[in-house]
C-alpha cells in the first residue's frame, strides 16, 4: 500500500537498518526509497525538546510485515518509502538548506559569487555529492563566499550542524543538469586497476554498469564474466574510484569488461530496471518465499508485486509435475544484488521490476520499429502529439513531443497569431488525423511558454513549452521521450527520424497518417555552407540528405527529430525551418534541444 504523507511527532519502533543524516524528512524519504531494503523511516527534526545528537538523523527501517509499531515522540517525523507506490520517483533535490552545515570530506574550496554557482560547481564536479557555501553575511571575512565541495562514502552527510549564514545543498547530477561527459562505451578485455570502493555480484556488465551509476562513490567499474579464469571472481562487479575521476591504468585481460558510471546521464538511461532474464543461471540470496509459477515471466511478476523481493530464480517444472508449474524463489539481500551467481543448474533468474519507476519513464522500451515505408504504425512514436487550433475552424497546427506528464515541447513559431492557450487542443496517441472527431478526448493547454529570446525561427530560440491542464496517463500509445543529456553533447547519433502530419511536398496538404523519414544529421559547418545568408548557431542542428528527397515540411513544425541511442529514444531536435522542403543541399534546420535542457528544466520544475 502506498502511503505518501509524513507522520508528525511519530516514531517507528525497531526495524533499524542504518542511520544517515539528512537535512529534511522529505529527503530522508528519498534516501529510504533508494535504499535496497528500506521500507519505512524515522527522521528527527531540530527541536529544543529533543536530544541534539539525534537532530537530522534519518533512521532507515525494514519490516517483514511492511509496518512497525508507532510511538509518540515530539520532533520525530516518520513515513514510508515510495517503493510501495506506483508513481514516478526522482532523486533530484534542488532544495537549498539555510543555516545548515553538512559534514563530509572537504576536497575542494574556492570562491563563488553565489550559492547557485557553488551548486553548479558541485554538479559539474565528478566527486561532489553536496556542498556548503559561506554567504557574504558570514561573520568571518576570510571565509565569506567560500564554496566547499564535499563527498562521503554514502553520498549523504556524516553529520549536520546548525551554522548561521551558511547554506548547503546537493549536487544536481540526478536532475540531468551536469555538463560532465558520459562515456557510454563498455571496453571488452579490459581491467581498470584502481581502488575498489565496493564489490557486488552481477549477471552481466550492463547490470554492473547500472549498479555503478546508482552507487554514490562509483566512477567506473570492472566486471569479470562467467568465463573469467578465477572461479571465485566470476560475475564479480568491482565498483571503483580514483582521485582524477578517470582510471589510472588499463590492463588488457581476457573475459573482463570495464566501463564508466553514467551518473550525469542517468535521466535518459535505465539504472534500476534490470529487465532481462538470465537463463541457466541461479541467483543466491536470502529466501523470502517459494511459490509455484507457470513461467519465469510469472515469477518476475510475483517478485515485482512482493515489495521486499529484489531478485528471483525460477526452476521450471519437471515433466508434468505440479500442473506444469515450476518453483519461483523470491529473494533479497542487504545490497539488492545476489550474494552468489551460479551457472549450469537450469534455473532462470532476474530482478524485480518494482524499481523501474525509479528510472525516467522515457527510458521504457517501445514497440519494435517497422522497417521501410513512410507511414507510421500505432505506438511507433508514442511521444508525438498533434496540436490543433480551434480558431477560426479546427485544424492541425503543429507537431509536438510529450516530455513529461504535463508538458509538451514544440516550436515557438507555431504560436504566431495565437492569442490565447484556450484555442489550443493537444491530441496524443493519434495515428490518423481522421480519428479526431468532436468527441475525441484532448488535453487543454493551461500555459504557452515561449523562450524569451525568440524573435523568428531563422534566428534561433525556436522553442516553446505547453503546460497541459490535466496530466497524461502514460500508456503504450502515449508516453514521453527522453531529453538528451548535457553529458552526451559529443554523441554522434546515427539513427534519427523526423515525424509529422505535414506536407509531403511544398504545395500540398496535411497528411492523414503520421509520416516518418529516416534522416542523417549534418554537421553545423556543412549546414552553414548551405545557408550562407543565415547564421547556423550551436543552438541549431541540421539534418537532411545531400540529394534532398526526404525532409520535414509545413505542418511538421514543432514535431520531434527523434534519435535512438543505446536502445533509448532522445528528442535531439525540434522541427524549425529550412529553405523549401527536401531540396537538394538544403538540410532541415532544427532547434538543438540539448542546448535548452537547462531552460526546459527551469520552466518545467518551477514551483
Amino acid at each position: 500500500e502506498c502511503v505518501t504523507q509524513l507522520l508528525k511527532d511519530t516514531c517507528f519502533e525497531g526495524g533499524d537498518i542504518t542511520t544517515v543524516f539528512t537535512p529534511s524528512a522529505k529527503y530522508c524519504q528519498v534516501v529510504c526509497t533508494y535504499h535496497p531494503r528500506c521500507l519505512l523511516f524515522t527522521f528527527t527534526a531540530e527541536s529544543p525538546s529533543e536530544d541534539p545528537t539525534r537532530w537530522f538523523t534519518c533512521v532507515l527501517k525494514d519490516s517483514v510485515t511492511e509496518t512497525l509499531p508507532r510511538v509518540n515522540r515530539t520532533a520525530a517525523i516518520s513515513g514510508y518509502s515510495f517503493k510501495q507506490c506506483s508513481h514516478q520517483i526522482s532523486a533530484c533535490n534542488k532544495d537549498i538548506y539555510v543555516d545548515l552545515d553538512m559534514k563530509g570530506i572537504n576536497y575542494n574550496s574556492s570562491v563563488a559569487k553565489s550559492a547557485q554557482e557553488c551548486q553548479e560547481r558541485c554538479t559539474d564536479d565528478v566527486h561532489c555529492h553536496f556542498f556548503t557555501y559561506a554567504t557574504r553575511q558570514f561573520p568571518s571575512l576570510e571565509h565569506r563566499n567560500i564554496c566547499l565541495l564535499k563527498h562521503t562514502q554514502t553520498g549523504t552527510p556524516t553529520r549536520i550542524t546548525k551554522l548561521d549564514k551558511v547554506v548547503s545543498g546537493f549536487s544536481l547530477k540526478s536532475c540531468a543538469l551536469s555538463n560532465l561527459a558520459c562515456i557510454r562505451d563498455i571496453f571488452p578485455n579490459t581491467v581498470f586497476a584502481d581502488s575498489n570502493i565496493d564489490s557486488v555480484m552481477a549477471p552481466d556488465a550492463f547490470v554492473c554498469g547500472r549498479i555503478c551509476t546508482h552507487h554514490p562513490g562509483c566512477l567506473f567499474f570492472t566486471f569479470f564474466s562467467q568465463e573469467w579464469p578465477k572461479e571465485s571472481q566470476r560475475n564479480l562487479c568491482l565498483l571503483k574510484t580514483s582521485e582524477s575521476g578517470l582510471p589510472s591504468t588499463r590492463i588488457k585481460k581476457s573475459k573482463a569488461l570495464s566501463g564508466f558510471s553514467l551518473q550525469s546521464c542517468r535521466h535518459s538511461i535505465p539504472v534500476f530496471c534490470h529487465s532481462s532474464f538470465y537463463h541457466d543461471t541461479d541467483f543466491l540470496g536470502e529466501e523470502l518465499d517459494i511459490v509455484a509459477a507457470k513461467s519465469h515471466e510469472a515469477c518476475q511478476k510475483l517478485c515485482t508485486n512482493a515489495v521486499r523481493c529484489q531478485f528471483f530464480t525460477y526452476t521450471p517444472a519437471q515433466a508434468s509435475c505440479n500442473e506444469g508449474k515450476g518453483k519461483c524463489y523470491l529473494k533479497l539481500s542487504s545490497n539488492g544484488s545476489p550474494t552468489k551467481i551460479l551457472h549450469g543448474r537450469g534455473g532462470i533468474s532476474g530482478y524485480t521490476l518494482r524499481l523501474c519507476k525509479m528510472d525516467n519513464e522515457c527510458t521504457t522500451k517501445i514497440k519494435p520499429r517497422i522497417v521501410g515505408g513512410t507511414a507510421s504504425v500505432r505506438g511507433e512514436w508514442p511521444w508525438q502529439v498533434t496540436l490543433h487550433t480551434t480558431s477560426p475552424t479546427q485544424r492541425h497546427l503543429c507537431g509536438g513531443s510529450i516530455i513529461g506528464n504535463q508538458w509538451i515541447l514544440t516550436a515557438a513559431h507555431c504560436f504566431y497569431g495565437v492569442e490565447s492557450p484556450k484555442i489550443l487542443r493537444v491530441y496524443s496517441g493519434i495515428l490518423n488525423q481522421s480519428e479526431i472527431k468532436e468527441d475525441t478526448s484532448f488535453f487543454g493547454v493551461q500555459e504557452i511558454i515561449i523562450h524569451d529570446q525568440y524573435k523568428m525561427a531563422e534566428s534561433g530560440y525556436d522553442i516553446a513549452l505547453l503546460k497541459l491542464e490535466t496530466t497524461v496517463n502514460y500508456t503504450d500509445s502515449q508516453r514521453p521521450i527522453c531529453l538528451p543529456s548535457k553529458g552526451d553533447r559529443n554523441v554522434i547519433y546515427t539513427d534519427c527520424w523526423v515525424t509529422g502530419w505535414g506536407y509531403r511536398k511544398l504545395r500540398d496538404k496535411i497528411q492523414n497518417t503520421l509520416q516518418k523519414a529516416k534522416i542523417p544529421l549534418v554537421t553545423n559547418e556543412e549546414c552553414q555552407k548551405r545557408y550562407r545568408g543565415h547564421k547556423i548557431t550551436h543552438k541549431m542542428i541540421c539534418a537532411g540528405y545531400r540529394e534532398g528527397g526526404k525532409d520535414a515540411c509545413k505542418g511538421d513544425s514543432g514535431g520531434p527529430l527523434s534519435c535512438k541511442h543505446n536502445e533509448v529514444w532522445h528528442l535531439v531536435g525540434i522541427t524549425s525551418w529550412g529553405e523549401g522542403c527536401a531540396q537538394r543541399e538544403r538540410p532541415g534546420v532544427y532547434t538543438n534541444v540539448v542546448e535548452y535542457v537547462d531552460w526546459i528544466l527551469e520552466k518545467t520544475q518551477a514551483v
Partner: nanobody, 120 residues
Framework: QVQLQESGGGSVQAGGSLRLSCAGD????????MAWFRQAPGKEREGVAL??????FISYTDSVKGRFTISQDDAKIYLQMNSLKPEDTAMYYC???????????????WGQGTQVTVSS
C-alpha cells in the same frame, strides 16, 4: 543546561606547550561553531580560535597565528598551544554556538574554564 568541560590547563615555562581539550554533550554535536576564548585578570574575554565543526572553517586571532592549532574529533575540540608566552596567561574557555563569530555574545554554551599560566 549544556555542559562543556575543559581540561589540560596548567603552569608552564615560556616556550613550552600545552594541549587543551573540550568535551561536550549532545549540543556540541548540533552546534556548527565551537571556539576557544580566554580572559586575563582585569581584561575582557577575547576569542583565540574558532572552528566550524562540519565545514572545518578555522580562524585564529593574530597574536596566536602560527603558534596555536585548533582541531576536532567527534564531539571534542582541542587547542594545541606551542611557543607559549607570558601574555598567553589567562583562563581559557570553550564555547559552542551557531555563529562562527569572535563575539562572546554569539555563543550560547560555555564551559567553566581551565587556567593556563606561563612564567618567564
Amino acid at each position: 543546561q549544556v555542559q562543556l568541560q575543559e581540561s589540560g590547563g596548567g603552569s608552564v615555562q615560556a616556550g613550552g606547550s600545552l594541549r587543551l581539550s573540550c568535551a561536550g554533550d549532545g549540543y556540541t554535536y548540533s552546534m556548527g561553531a565551537m571556539a576557544w576564548f580566554r580572559q586575563a585578570p582585569g581584561k575582557e574575554r577575547e576569542g583565540v580560535a574558532l572552528i566550524a565543526t562540519s565545514s572545518g572553517f578555522i580562524s585564529y586571532t593574530d597574536s596566536v597565528k602560527g603558534r596555536f592549532t585548533i582541531s576536532q574529533d567527534d564531539a571534542k575540540i582541542y587547542l594545541q598551544m606551542n611557543s607559549l608566552k607570558p601574555e598567553d596567561t589567562a583562563m581559557y574557555y570553550c564555547a559552542a554556538g551557531t555563529q562562527f563569530s569572535w563575539s562572546p555574545g554569539s555563543y550560547n554554551y560555555w564551559g567553566q574554564g581551565t587556567q593556563v599560566t606561563v612564567s618567564s
